[in-house]
Amino acid sequence: MAPWPELGDAQPNPDKYLEGAAGQQPTAPDKSKETNKTDNTEAPVTKIELLPSYSTATLIDEPTEVDDPWNLPTLQDSGIKWSERDTKGKILCFFQGIGRLILLLGFLYFFVCSLDILSSAFQLVGGKMAGQFFSNSSIMSNPLLGLVIGVLVTVLVQSSSTSTSIVVSMVSSSLLTVRAAIPIIMGANIGTSITNTIVALMQVGDRSEFRRAFAGATVHDFFNWLSVLVLLPVEVATHYLEIITQLIVESFHFKNGEDAPDLLKVITKPFTKLIVQLDKKVISQIAMNDEKAKNKSLVKIWCKTFTNKTQINVTVPSTANCTSPSLCWTDGIQNWTMKNVTYKENIAKCQHIFVNFHLPDLAVGTILLILSLLVLCGCLIMIVKILGSVLKGQVATVIKKTINTDFPFPFAWLTGYLAILVGAGMTFIVQSSSVFTSALTPLIGIGVITIERAYPLTLGSNIGTTTTAILAALASPGNALRSSLQIALCHFFFNISGILLWYPIPFTRLPIRMAKGLGNISAKYRWFAVFYLIIFFFLIPLTVFGLSLAGWRVLVGVGVPVVFIIILVLCLRLLQSRCPRVLPKKLQNWNFLPLWMRSLKPWDAVVSKFTGCFQMRCCCCCRVCCRACCLLCDCPKCCRCSKCCEDLEEAQEGQDVPVKAPETFDNITISREAQGEVPASDSKTECTAL
């Protein structure tokens, strides 16, 4: 149950620490220089100095020859300098630059399109199931169930706007109260952060790149989880979100507004609608207990239809079921009444690939899921490659300085808030926090943006997506305006509250430290990234869902001991790192626990054995497949022929290099094992030949 620390020999030393501003970290040397580092697992470990946890940027002063894996890499420019080129070379270089820019924009376009298709694929695979989650009556009384339903539905449909719109329609139809909807919205906020975490997994080929990318993506997850952890109990106790938003909605006389501008969709829709088009109303109908919707396909077949309102005669069990007494009659045997029906006449079929295949939703979804992940991965690799070739030397320095440097004193604190505004603005433009954070992930991976800077951008993205929802709410029809606006405002104030909790004071920026901790673990044990994804986005929500269905007694009976153990472990961990002398000798470290409970090494052995069968089979496969293989089996030799996972990793496998790392990983999340034994970076873990 405990984290995996092996900290018997760690001694606190409050005198030795460095304070560094976010984004002003020294840059690490060239990757190529790191390859000659040796590794000896049995070597004595450099003592790690533990520090008071009051700044996110506090680093441990380690031997100077060791590099911090969180330092941004220097992307060396190996090409000929501009001044040394002749006219022909300059023209060629210029056109190469233009070509790269076009390619970059092209791959970025297909990257965004593949995210859209990925969302459609998830909806086809799990949309109906997601809709059924909503039809659970216990949501009304159990906020925890509402929360996990929000997570699961958003993960299943890969779109917080879809799950939010279902909630809005349920509130408008009085199937759900605003009070019951708030935890679902919180859950949707968590669920939407899975997309960029999936994108981060695509950068698994390079350990140091993966460390940064995964941490950069999961900073969003941790922010959302921590916000919920604090704000859900507060909301349940005080209903502050409900009260504030109700006051706002009631004090303003809103007129129906215009629809939120679809800026990115305008560009991507022409392509994505050729792949697949979905009838998203089906999920909402299932959520609202429409039995007929359960048999409907999500794949849109008819795009042009004519709706004709007509009256038809229908039989009813008795005259009491008649529309009105005057519209009631009998044929002598059965009672009849007149019903208004909307008759839909199909005029023109949609023009997408799957329109004439008549495949089940699951089949279409699976095909699209595989294809979109492949395209997503391929585009990401190409984006990283192009950015890697563009962002070298001076260009990289300028960009990195522009993005990561703070304003001059005394306005340095304003930089982060500007980043929040930028994140919000960018998200408002692209109309999707998933797209924005997913685009940010590879930039964090290749070292253009620091996690410290990505954090406020991500927080801004969370705000941006709620402003879009507010605009969409203002464009709602009269009956849905109040409920949709109140829910959109709840979403907005929840994110504002989260920012107030986890951003203004550097000490409270826990998500950064937790994400870096997870990044370190995942860089060492890459399977842990998938494990984290499954646990946090599927298993925990599904377990809570299952326990909630069993009844609140079962939920409390299981939940309370689990929460108690977690708190106990955290308290013990804190005491071990701050004042171990208070504790009995046995409890001063985790050595009293069996190895499997305090280290990932035994688990790694199990995973390696389990994935061993994949190791030999994935040779000579395409680069994308190889990356997936490397992610699954963490194999150093498996893809030698495609040069994807270099033999170089063999040399780094057993390294034990002490690193300079933010002190709180050691205090809270992460062991020496994950910290110290992770190589600073990989050299060439990407395929050289595409």
Partner: antibody
Framework: QVQLVQSGAEVKKPGASVKVSCKTS????????MHWVRQAPGQGLEWIGA????????AYNQKFKGRVTMTADTSTSTVYMELSSLRSEDTAVYYC????????????WGQGTLVTVSS | DIQMTQSPSFLSASVGDRVTITCKAS??????VAWYQQKPGKSPKLLIY???TRHSGVPDRFSGSGSGTEFIFTISSVQPEDFATYFC?????????FGAGTKLEIK
């Protein structure tokens, strides 16, 4: 064209039963209800009940409940109406009539069967 | 049961006259009313259903109107073949009931 041909006149003693048949043609037998209406000499029309040949479902006027039985034979497209415990006031012309689909108006009628009840 | 009160019971008219027959329902029947024509020794014949809709093959001199509880049957210009007995019928609820009839005679 739609045709409804009823069985011939019947003379019955009080307490006896009578079974009148109505053979249909010219339409799909199982789609429309078949009504039975009687008319006492010099009197108005009185609805006895109806049968839906498609399922055999029936509905009877409360006045005749327990005394009337309606059946349908889909193989011969014929409906039958049996009235038991006959009384002298049951003397009337009995008509079968096809109900229009979806409502209780009767568009085609049989020629009628005179049932006389006398001792 | 719903009572259908038809008036008048007897009606004398000449060829070319406009005649109206009234039928009153004891409760609201909407428009679930039909009108029939019966000649002596013959079966009834459907003329109007849904209070206003003419059955196929019925001349347009026959028309119906009304809803709720009051219904009117009109022959705009009586023809020699129109002299017969006319019945109204409600099919709003079971049992189906008929009016007592109106006998149209030659004046």
């Amino acid at each position: 064209q739609v045709q409804l041909v009823q069985s011939g006149a019947e003379v019955k003693k009080p307490g006896a039963s009578v079974k009148v048949s109505c053979k249909t043609s010219g339409y799909t037998f199982t789609t429309n209800n078949m009504h039975w209406v009687r008319q006492a000499p010099g009197q108005g029309l009185e609805w006895i009940g109806a049968i839906y040949p498609g399922s055999g479902a029936t509905a009877y006027n409360q006045k005749f409940k327990g005394r009337v039985t309606m059946t349908a034979d889909t193989s011969t497209s014929t409906v039958y109406m049996e009235l038991s415990s006959l009384r002298s006031e049951d003397t009337a012309v009995y008509y079968c009539a096809r109900g229009m689909y979806g409502h209780g108006a009767m568009d085609y009628w049989g020629q009628g069967t005179l049932v006389t009840v006398s001792s | 049961d719903i009572q259908m009160t038809q008036s008048p019971s007897f009606l004398s008219a000449s060829v070319g006259d406009r005649v109206t027959i009234t039928c009153k329902a004891s409760q609201d029947v909407g428009t679930a009313v039909a009108w029939y024509q019966q000649k002596p020794g013959k079966s009834p014949k459907l003329l109007i259903y849904w209070a206003t809709t003419r059955h196929s093959g019925v001349p347009d001199r026959f028309s119906g109107s009304g809803s709720g509880t009051e219904f009117i049957f009109t022959i705009s210009s009586v023809q020699p073949e129109d002299f017969a007995t006319y019945f109204c019928q409600q099919y709003s609820s079971n049992p189906l009931t008929f009016g007592a009839g109106t006998k149209l005679e030659i004046k």
